[in-house]
């Protein structure tokens, strides 16, 4: 995902509803005018804004990188909602990029979890059953197996 | 003359309360939001709260229970209430009109604030 | 809320040096960044807005550059009464962020 940047606002174009502030505050899908006494709305698909707020300006919509679809578009009031392609996952540690699922556990253990935009297939260690945690295995260790298969 | 005066400040014993006031003078402060700031003896600018326009007020976390910022439109002027005061709110105190995208653009000459016993 | 940091904390400097001072938000806020200069017993002064637009009657000699996370004050030819400290401030989001200082760059004579 492209980070999150902010956009300033240009002088509200003729077609940018307005309206005034209450409490101080302007809300979701609106920022604060440079004099404080307008609410000026954000601009459809290309910055948001989530709650309310006296920002001088929107945020800027995220971009789905290649490598990730879009699960649904930004609005004045929500982000980019962007996933990782099948096959990819995100890890929380390294939320920049979306990297390669292995495609089996090690010897000597046994898929538990599948791949998810989220999340690394899961191998535990067949007789403990605990979790293994680290880098993929190289080639010649892995067993693979097809999906809803156990690997032997 | 456009210009802030704060008055108010003095000695005061931990645990007691103040009122400062602030008195604007060439514009009306009820068109502005307005804030608080204090200045510790030899250390930096601290940001204490505001007020806006519409009265609504905000304020950093440091003074959210303790500290109140009101508004007399009839008089001009701007309050800080501070209650339950300790000796780590020893500072100056300012005044200032904040104009949001350009910054606190007038600020008062401030006035000092001692808590000991 | 936004916390700003101001680096250095001190420089000395002589009368015609360029001095440059940083500030960095912890998020951005676009150039609503405003610099102050103080001098002992009184308030601070406003330089400069929207980070690089300057202050009214301030010398052309101050310039503030930067937007999203990274501002700079520079005075290109010090002068003996720039010897001060210089604060930075968030502009936007003030009820929604706070808006702290920066810590302060003290300017002191070489």
């Known amino acids: 995902i492209t980070q999150q940047d902010l956009a300033p606002q240009q002088r509200a174009a003729p077609q940018q509803k307005r309206s005034s502030p209450s409490e101080g505050l302007c809300p979701p899908g609106h920022h604060i005018s440079e004099d404080g006494r307008d609410c000026i709305s954000c601009k459809y698909g290309q910055d948001y804004s989530t709650h309310w707020n006296d920002l001088l300006f929107c945020l800027r919509c995220t971009r789905c990188d290649s490598g990730e679809v879009e699960l649904s578009p930004c609005t004045t009031t929500r982000n980019t909602v962007c996933q990782c392609e099948e096959g990819t996952f995100r890890e929380e540690d390294s939320p920049e990029m979306c990297r390669k699922c292995r495609t089996g556990c090690p010897r000597g253990m046994v898929k538990v979890g599948d791949c998810t935009p989220w999340s690394d297939i899961e191998c535990v260690h067949k007789e403990s059953g605990t979790k293994h945690s680290g880098e993929a295995p190289a080639v010649e260790e892995t067993v693979t197996s097809s999906p809803g298969t156990p690997a032997s | 003359e456009v210009q802030l005066v704060e008055t108010g400040g003095g000695l005061i014993q931990p645990g007691g309360s103040l009122r400062l006031s602030c008195a604007a003078s060439?514009?009306?402060?009820?068109?502005?939001?307005m804030i608080w700031v204090r200045q510790a003896p030899g250390k930096g600018l601290e940001y204490i709260g505001f007020?806006?326009?519409?009265?609504?007020?905000y304020y950093a976390d440091s003074a959210k229970g303790r500290f109140t910022i009101s508004r007399d439109n009839s008089k001009n002027t701007l309050y800080l209430q501070m209650n339950s005061l300790r000796a780590e709110d020893t500072a100056v105190y300012y005044c200032?009109?904040?104009?949001?995208?350009?910054?606190?653009?007038?600020w008062g000459r401030g006035t000092l604030v001692t808590v000991s016993s | 809320d936004i916390q700003m940091t101001q680096s250095p904390s001190s420089l000395s400097a002589s009368v015609g040096d360029r001095v440059t001072i940083t500030c960095r938000a912890s998020?951005?806020?676009?150039?609503?960044l405003s610099w102050y200069q103080q001098k002992p017993g009184q308030p601070p002064k406003r330089l400069i807005y929207?980070?690089?637009t300057l202050a009214s009657g301030v010398p052309s000699r101050f310039s503030g550059s930067g937007s999203g996370t990274d501002f700079t004050l520079t005075i290109s030819s010090l002068q003996p009464e720039d010897f001060a400290t210089y604060y930075c401030?968030?502009?936007?989001?003030?009820?929604?962020?706070?808006?702290?200082f920066g810590g302060g760059t003290k300017v002191e004579i070489k």
């Open positions: 200032a009109r904040y104009t949001y995208s350009d910054g606190t653009d007038l």
């Open positions: 060439g514009f009306t402060v009820s068109r502005y939001a």
């Open positions: 007020i806006t326009s519409d009265g609504s007020t």
């Open positions: 998020q951005s806020i676009s150039t609503y």
């Open positions: 929207k980070a690089s």
């Open positions: 401030q968030p502009n936007s989001g003030i009820a929604t962020y706070g808006a702290a």
